[in-house]
Interface confidence: low
């Protein structure tokens, strides 16, 4: 394992004094209820904290909330509850913070039962001032900001009306009734499902998908018989009832619903589901649930049109009951994803893909670690990491795996070493190369966060007892130092740092409890004096990502190109700084058959990299011929993997087949059609690092 505290470690000198001078305590004059924290804007230092206290009385719930504001990253807070007229704010709606650096905030108030509508408080100056606005409806959901223009808001009412505001919530207009789900699309487009019969719960599968591009002046029904819809990257997905109304199939559009194509995916029955695990403008990871309450399904990866899919991973764990999946995009290295499979023996096992779902392999265990009791062979086993499933099943796992795009190669996760995920107390493991190799960094479960683009990792032990110590590392988790941030331990509730991992401030939240009272308290620690100087050129070293065989000319090639990064040396204790930009040098690789997917009408036989023509088109492929886009029907059987940049090398040029000749009348009758797709096990490669960890794009 990594050197411990007592071994010779590149210690930071005089860190106690430096951190003590930069530790700021704030005690909130508040009854302890719940607390929520939001960052307003990027690099502004503005934090809003909402504390709420509920007193459930016999007839009603009496509530009190307080609003606090900091503009120095949490070192000091000011009570600004009077700006919202001491109103009780509904915590289930949270604080709706505007996109980018708009400085906009919307708080939704609790109103009395008999009122005509709800009430909101709006700020457009980073919460310095608020305007009270009474709504003509009772909101069902949090206000949704248009990604393109933060003045445009969308909300659903408790009566299923769709309401739009064009002046940041000052004036509202109901643009449609009987709306079940609404989402902002691109360029100010609004998509929503509506049921003209009035019910959203009973008639799933009979919904209409509608679109407005002029904020409700006009509408276009872009699809019917809709069960659900989702947006991911450039793709609009609809699951559409088919057959005798018992099956659903995915249809995909890349032009906002003007035209659709059937995705070549298996249809699902009423007890199954589809889920977009990740999507960008180039491709999609789609989970298709297995029939029955199996708890697993199959991951498919799409081509660049979102219509042709290759089988990526079978027995992918995704619970039907709670909807948990361990699928995570490792954002610190292009093309890397981890997830869990449910093995035949019902054990849960971790797998990782370094090539955007082309191949999945077990995680390599740390070199010096011993296999635990789950291992049949004490010498041969792998690392298994805990994610959403472990948390849902109540294991002692306080956090999901963590990675950040600007902390290249760095991954933190709870895990165990064996043949499967263990129910025993997990430890914290760290990878500095995007998941290829791992070290055991900390014993037992911890909360952790990344600061200064990976220059510092901070961790706090997960304990039921009060705590007063944090641990930090300046060398990507190899060596750790401890700092006692308060004499009086606190009951820890959360670790907060500014999103984006560029900050050098960390806030530790918790509460103190004396005989009769409990109070919220926060400690904000600024690490700026630990990293005294700015990093220089000599502090960085060249690192080739995805390197597994330095002798191989194609070493590091993923998705047709390799990337060299400038990375901070582990021995350098310096500031990357807020303006740090990842420096990378890409170089194009030669093409191989692994750079291509099998196109529509083709598949890869087991253990073969060549794409072979399907003997005949099946299922709904005749309508694909007529109502699909024709350019899909002329193919040489191969299609470049989305995002693949390879050039030269293997060029699978062969006779261009015109699949339209198969589009004749000698098809099975509709009654006998089955729509199983013939997934091809194509190799694939990396994404553009745009997914948040554990953010499922769409679950039906």
């Amino acid at each position: 394992s990594a050197p411990g505290e007592d071994e010779e470690c590149g210690r930071v000198r005089d860190f106690v004094a430096k951190l003590a001078n930069n530790t700021h305590q704030h005690v909130f004059d508040d009854l302890r209820g719940s607390v929520s924290l939001s960052w307003v804007g990027d690099s502004t230092g503005v934090i809003l904290v909402l504390t709420t206290f509920h007193v459930p009385l016999v007839i009603m719930t009496f509530g009190q909330s307080k609003l606090y504001r900091s503009e120095d990253y949490g070192k000091n807070f000011k009570d600004i509850t009077d700006l919202i007229n001491n109103t009780f704010i509904r915590t289930e709606f949270g604080m709706a913070i505007g996109p980018e650096n708009s400085g906009k905030v919307v708080l939704t108030a609790e109103v009395s039962g008999g009122s005509r509508g709800g009430r909101i408080f709006r700020s457009s100056d980073f919460a310095k001032n608020f305007v009270q606005t009474d709504l003509p409806f009772h909101p069902l959901t949090q206000m949704m900001y248009s990604p393109q223009n933060s003045d445009y808001l969308l909300a659903l009412s408790t009566e299923n009306g769709l309401w739009v505001s064009k002046n940041f919530g000052g004036k509202w207009e109901e643009i449609h009734k009987t709306v079940c789900l609404a989402k902002w699309g691109r360029k100010g487009t609004i998509f929503f499902t509506a049921n003209h019969n009035g019910s959203c719960s009973n008639d799933r599968g009979m919904l209409e998908l509608e679109r407005t591009t002029d904020y409700g002046k006009s509408f276009k029904t872009v699809a019917s018989k809709i069960y659900s819809f989702g947006l991911g990257g450039k793709f609009l997905f609809a699951s559409v009832m088919t057959g005798k109304g018992t099956l659903r199939a995915i249809h995909v559009s890349v032009d906002d619903g003007d035209t659709w194509n059937m995705a070549q995916l298996p249809p699902v029955g009423h007890e199954q589901f589809y889920s977009i695990l990740a999507a960008n403008d180039e491709m999609v990871f789609m989970h298709v649930d297995e029939p029955g309450d199996s708890g697993f399904g199959t991951i498919y990866v799409s081509d660049d049109r979102g219509t042709v899919y290759s089988k990526s991973l079978e027995r992918h764990l995704y619970t039907t009951t709670g909807g948990e999946t361990d699928f995570i995009n490792v954002t610190s290295l292009r093309g890397v994803f981890t997830t869990s499979i449910l093995a035949e023996d019902k054990s849960v096992q971790s797998v990782i893909s370094f090539d955007q779902g082309g191949e999945w392999v077990p995680l390599r265990k740390p070199a010096d670690s011993k296999c635990d009791a789950t291992a049949r062979d004490p010498e041969k086993c792998s690392l298994h990491i805990h994610a959403a499933y472990s948390i849902a099943t109540g294991l002692n796992v306080p956090m999901l795996p963590l990675s950040e795009p600007n902390a290249v190669g760095l991954v933190l996760a709870h895990g165990s070493v064996g043949d499967a995920i263990s129910v025993m107390r997990p430890d914290v493991y760290v990878s500095d190369d995007g998941g290829y190799t791992w070290i055991k960094a900390l014993e037992g479960p911890h909360y952790y966060t990344i600061l200064d683009s990976g220059g510092i990792i901070v961790a706090i032990e997960h304990s039921s007892r009060p705590i007063n110590v944090i641990k930090f590392s300046t060398d990507e988790g190899q060596c750790w130092q401890t700092y006692t941030f308060t004499r009086d331990p606190i009951y820890f509730t959360g670790l907060a740092s500014e999103p984006g991992a560029r900050s050098m401030n960390i806030s530790i939240w918790g509460f103190t409890e004396s005989f009769l009272t409990s109070q919220w308290v926060s400690y904000t620690i600024d690490f700026k004096d630990i990293l005294e100087r700015n990093c220089e050129e000599k502090d960085y070293t060249i690192w080739l990502a995805h390197s597994t065989d330095p002798e191989d000319y194609e070493d590091g090639c993923i998705l047709g190109y390799k990337e060299q990064f400038l990375r901070l040396r582990k021995s350098s204790v310096c500031q990357n700084g807020r303006d740090y930009v990842v420096t990378k040098q890409p170089s194009i690789c030669l093409c191989s058959l692994e750079d291509f997917l099998c196109d529509f009408g083709y598949y890869r036989p087991e253990n073969d990299s060549k794409c072979v023509e399907q003997p005949e088109l099946k299922g709904h492929d005749l309508e694909f011929c007529l109502y699909g886009r024709e350019e899909h029907l002329t193919t040489n059987g191969y299609r470049k993997i989305p995002g693949d940049k390879c050039q030269g090398g293997v060029n699978p040029v062969r006779e261009v087949k015109d699949l339209k000749k198969k589009c004749t009348s000698n098809f099975l009758s509709p009654e006998k059609q089955n729509s199983k797709s013939n997934g091809s096990a194509g190799g694939s490669g990396g994404l553009n690092d745009i997914f948040e960890a554990q953010k499922i794009e769409w679950h039906e």
Partner: antibody, heavy 118, light 111 residues
Framework: EVQLVESGGDLVKPGGSLKLSCAAS????????MSWVRQTPDKRLEWVAI????????HYPDSVKGRFTISRDNAKNTLYLQMSSLKSEDTAMYYC???????????WGQGTSVTVSS | QAVVTQESALTTSPGETVTLTCRSS?????????ANWVQEKPDHLFTGLIG???NRAPGVPARFSGSLIGDKAALTITGAQTEDEAIYFC??????????FGGGTKLTVLG
């Protein structure tokens, strides 16, 4: 607003030829399969030809196969029906139509009359 | 060749609900037959009402709805109006015959 406007109908002798046109507007013409449908004097509707979005895939019922040719010019948003070796039973009102598959709705033109008579 | 059968004529009164059906000689109509419903009014005025079993065309009043009832495709007019008096044709898609039309239903709305 979607519009389909047919033209080219006429009185023609048996064995003669005629070319019908259909100008489309108000939707992305190049994205949809299009059909010609006719209504005979006894008011029955009969599908006559279908062409896919890009124009390279066509199909016809046996009654007109080999005599009628459907084509399209996506640049001009126009659908065509070339009819040759016309018979008296081809006398009908001819409609250009967007009949619909799974996820769209149908549109029809106002029709153009073809009479085959000596 | 598949044969598509419709009621030859139906009569209803304003405000009533009326259902027109469309049967296939090959067996049950399914959503894979993508039933289209077309309205013909005097002077050869055809309007596409429903596509793909139940997709109402833009501009078509909400009182028109398409569905499957039993083994048939159906067009239901909820609250018929005098201007709904017309001939209604259904068209079914078959993978071997493509589009086949029914003989049409003449709907009379007694004013």
């Amino acid at each position: 607003e979607v519009q389909l406007v047919e033209s080219g109908g006429d009185l023609v002798k048996p064995g003669g030829s005629l070319k019908l046109s259909c100008a489309a507007s108000g939707f992305t013409f190049s994205s949809y399969g299009m059909s010609w449908v006719r209504q005979t004097p006894d008011k029955r509707l009969e599908w006559v030809a279908i062409i896919s979005s890009g124009g390279s895939y066509t199909h016809y019922p046996d009654s007109v196969k080999g005599r009628f040719t459907i084509s399209r010019d996506n640049a001009k948003n126009t659908l065509y029906l070339q009819m040759s070796s016309l018979k008296s039973e081809d006398t009908a009102m001819y409609y250009c139509a967007r009949l619909c598959g799974p996820l769209c709705s149908g549109y029809w033109g106002q029709g153009t009359s073809v009479t085959v008579s000596s | 060749q598949a044969v598509v059968t419709q009621e030859s004529a139906l009569t209803t009164s304003p405000g009533e609900t009326v259902t027109l059906t469309c049967r296939s000689s090959t067996g049950a109509v399914t959503t894979s037959n993508y039933a289209n419903w077309v309205q013909e009014k005097p002077d050869h005025l055809f309007t596409g009402l429903i596509g793909g079993t139940n997709n109402r065309a833009p501009g078509v009043p909400a009182r028109f709805s398409g569905s499957l009832i039993g083994d048939k495709a159906a067009l239901t007019i909820t609250g018929a109006q005098t201007e709904d008096e017309a001939i209604y044709f259904c068209a079914l898609w078959y993978s071997n015959h493509f589009w086949v039309f029914g003989g049409g239903t003449k709907l009379t709305v007694l004013g």
